[in-house]
């Protein structure tokens, strides 16, 4: 009981002046609170409280449930308490069967005793099962038994409070421990697709999957840089204890261009937060964008191979693709495939394989592609480089020597004179006239060049060489002259093909 010091308020006095009182069931509980400023008695046991404004608390026939703490409070807010045990052989424990534990925290099994003089007050597993080896507890007859540092593994543990009364073990009603897991990691979030491309009016639907130890994980879909509440639908599952999954589905039934943007699925728990985003692009209509992977003007040597390659973006997916040359469609020699197997892929590749190209196969090769909304095409101009070919060389009636050569790129014709029997023609002769004959003709064929010189310039026996050359190779033709008196006579002209890096004669 409190000691009174004059001049300052003191706590009330209780009669009987004890901290604990044991009363037999059926007997009277009579408690007197002595204080000039008495306010109330309060009774507390388990989760219940009762009040009494009379300064004398009387319970005529005490029951086990009257066991508890009786507190008297005065007008200064000071109080004194006495704990009363109502001993009932038929009811050793008062029980509040609600038993929750938070992982890693202590929790109280509320089974206070009605008789403080029993022994071996402890916890026991149900149906004789042992308690987990690492379960530690601390008994308190007035409150119950505290389980220390609750583990997740104790979830759904069935147990009893137990005590020995007159040499006999007595069990309380059963308790089921429900453990609330501690969040020890952020939620795991994933999204059905990282990006979406839609046409106006199409439905946008995306699902976020949130996984955590408890359904108390918070999740929401948010639009980046927007506070607007989005409409979500949920599905959830418990895959066993501490394994919860939620699917949050965001739907825009008729997407508009201004719905385009980044959508974030955000989840958090008491440990932290996680998020994942998806990008929506809404276009007013479909599109095709073609990107050549090589220059659209292609030079290739006669007899060599070339691959015409395009990449293209198509949305919706491409329906028809074709390669065309001279109004003819290729049925083979080409392939078309998606750039990736990703379901969001809109990029494709098309390749036309041209093999052992001839000089006559230059021209415009066109790739055409279409989908349900648009058509698109791209043209490649293919030039086949060919060595010059001397088509004609003649002595004209007007005394001119003429040499006509065809090839690509445009050949250059040079003239040389070889006096007597010399093999090497080094003295160059300037032409009188040079014309490109088909400059206005087909744009991709061989180019034809005609060059003429005046034969009257030659005064001695010898050979005139017409040499046609370009980047690919060179070809020569020869005019042999012999003078008979004053007359000049042409003797069997012949040609010599000289490849770019070789020199040999054909007679």
């Amino acid at each position: 009981q409190p000691s009174v010091s004059p001049g300052e308020p003191s706590p009330p006095s209780i009669h009987p002046a004890k901290s604990e009182l044991i009363v037999r069931v059926g007997n009277e509980i009579r408690l007197l609170c002595i204080d000039p400023g008495f306010v109330k008695w309060t009774f507390e046991i388990l989760d219940e409280t009762n009040e009494n404004k009379q300064n004398e608390w009387i319970t005529e026939k005490a029951e086990a449930t009257n066991t508890g703490k009786y507190t008297c409070t005065n007008k200064h807010g000071l109080s004194s308490s006495i704990y009363v045990f109502v001993r009932d052989p038929a009811k050793l424990f008062l029980v509040d069967r609600s038993l929750y534990g938070k992982e890693d925290n202590d929790t109280l099994v509320r089974c206070p005793l009605t008789d403080p003089e029993v022994t071996s007050y402890s916890l026991k597993g149900c149906q004789g099962k042992p308690l987990p080896k690492d379960l530690r507890f601390v008994p308190d007859p007035k409150a119950g038994i505290t389980i220390k540092s609750v583990k997740r593994a104790y979830h759904r543990l069935c147990l009893h409070c137990s005590a020995d009364q007159e040499g006999k073990s007595v069990l309380s009603d059963k308790f089921i421990l429900k453990v609330r897991p501690a969040f020890k990691a952020v939620p795991v979030v994933s999204v059905s697709k990282a990006s979406y491309l839609l046409r106006e009016g199409e439905e946008f639907t995306v699902t976020c999957t949130i996984k955590d130890v408890s359904s108390s994980v918070y999740s929401t879909w948010k639009r980046e840089n927007s506070q607007t509440k989005l409409q979500e639908k949920y599905n959830s599952w418990h895959h066993g204890d501490f394994n919860y999954e939620r699917q949050a589905t965001l739907t825009i039934s008729s997407a508009r261009v201004n719905d385009s943007g980044v959508f974030m699925c955000y989840a958090n728990n008491t440990f932290g937060s996680a998020n994942v985003t998806t990008t929506l692009e809404v276009v007013d209509k479909g599109f095709i964008n073609i990107f050549p992977m090589i220059n659209t003007t292609v030079f290739v040597n006669d007899g060599e191979n070339v691959d015409l390659i395009v990449e293209y973006e198509a949305f919706p997916k491409p329906e028809h693709q074709q390669w065309i040359y001279m109004n003819r469609t290729f049925t083979d020699k080409w392939e078309d495939y998606p750039k990736s197997e990703n379901e969001s892929n809109i990029r494709y590749v098309s390749e036309l394989h041209l093999t052992r190209l001839k000089g006559t196969e230059g021209g415009t090769y066109t790739f055409l592609v279409s989908n349900s909304d648009v058509n698109a095409s791209i043209a490649f101009n293919v030039y086949v480089n060919t060595k010059p070919e001397i088509l004609t060389y003649d002595r004209l009636v007007n005394g001119m020597l003429q040499c006509v050569a065809a090839g690509f790129p445009e050949p250059t014709i040079d003239w040389y004179f070889c006096p007597g029997t010399e093999q090497r023609c080094s003295a160059s002769v300037l032409p009188v006239d040079v014309q490109t004959l088909n400059a206005s003709g087909p744009p991709f064929g061989k180019l034809v060049v005609q060059s003429s010189i005046d034969s009257s310039a030659f005064k001695h026996n010898g050979t005139v060489e017409c040499k046609a050359y370009n980047d690919v190779g060179k070809t020569s033709a020869y005019f042999n002259f012999a003078f008979k008196g004053n007359n000049k006579e042409q003797i069997h002209p012949h040609t010599l093909f000289t490849p770019r890096s070789h020199h040999h004669h054909h007679h």
């Epitope: 989760d47 219940e48 409280t49 009762n50 609600s98 929750y100 938070k102 925290n105 759904r156 059963k174 089921i176 429900k178 609330r180 408890s214 359904s215 108390s216 994980v217 918070y218 959830s236 418990h238 204890d241 919860y244 728990n269 008491t270």
Partner: antibody
Framework: QVQLVQSGAEVKKPGSSVKVSCKAS????????ISWVRQAPGQGLEWMGT????????RYAQKFQGRVTITADESTSTAYMELSSLRSEDTAVYYC???????????WGQGTLVTVSS | DIQMTQSPSSLSASVGDRVTITCRAS??????LAWYQQKPGKAPKLLIY???SLQSGVPSRFSGSGSGTDFTLTISSLQPEDFATYYC?????????FGQGTKVEIK
């Protein structure tokens, strides 16, 4: 004995929100879970969500996720349930009850009638 | 979520009759099942918890049995005050579901 006392009846317009309170007396508020259950006229019981025990986020029924918010104020031993974007089918009696974290409901409030009407 | 199916949805009985109501869970819920009684205009009242434990203050004529997916509420001798609607409820996980109810009427 623990008692749960709920706020009075409400009449609300479609699209608005309602917030119902549930005050616990005669017991320790923090050691329990508090749940909300609703019952439409002539219909069965429907669990909406649970808060507690201990701190942490509430758990909601997937049907109400995103539309219901359950909170608790330990200092006043009061739990609250707010339901937004009300529609006529939300007309029901809303009950608070003690329990619900893997447990039954042993104590119930008297119920609050919420009528949604234009 | 776990679905609870109650049967019958209604029944007529006389005072003194033995009445049985069944409840089936869509997956095993061990014994995490409660039974409630509700009278018109009143809040539900807990009768049975953990499938077979009688709530304090509830008359012993009420009993519950079952485990896993199939459960039964039995009223051994129906009394006038027992005419009401009865609901089963599972609480195996954090998400709770009720049966649709069984209305017990006077024959």
């Amino acid at each position: 004995q623990v008692q749960l006392v709920q706020s009075g009846a409400e009449v609300k317009k479609p699209g608005s929100s309602v917030k119902v309170s549930c005050k616990a007396s005669g017991g320790t508020f923090s050691s329990y879970a508090i749940s909300w259950v609703r019952q439409a006229p002539g219909q069965g019981l429907e669990w909406m969500g649970t808060i507690g025990p201990f701190e942490g986020q509430p758990r909601y029924a997937q049907k109400f996720q995103g539309r219901v918010t359950i909170t608790a104020d330990e200092s006043t031993s009061t739990a609250y349930m707010e339901l937004s974007s009300l529609r006529s089918e939300d007309t029901a009696v809303y009950y608070c009850a003690r329990g619900g974290y893997i447990s039954d409901f042993d104590v119930w409030g008297q119920g609050t009638l919420v009528t949604v009407s234009s | 979520d776990i679905q609870m199916t109650q049967s019958p949805s209604s029944l007529s009985a006389s005072v003194g009759d033995r009445v049985t109501i069944t409840c089936r869970a869509s997956q095993s819920i061990s014994n995490y099942l409660a039974w409630y009684q509700q009278k018109p205009g009143k809040a539900p009242k807990l009768l049975i918890y953990d499938a077979s434990s009688l709530q304090s203050g509830v008359p012993s004529r009420f009993s519950g049995s079952g485990s896993g997916t199939d459960f039964t509420l039995t009223i051994s001798s129906l009394q006038p005050e027992d005419f009401a609607t009865y609901y089963c409820q599972q609480y195996y996980y954090e998400s709770i579901t009720f049966g649709q109810g069984t209305k017990v009427e006077i024959k």
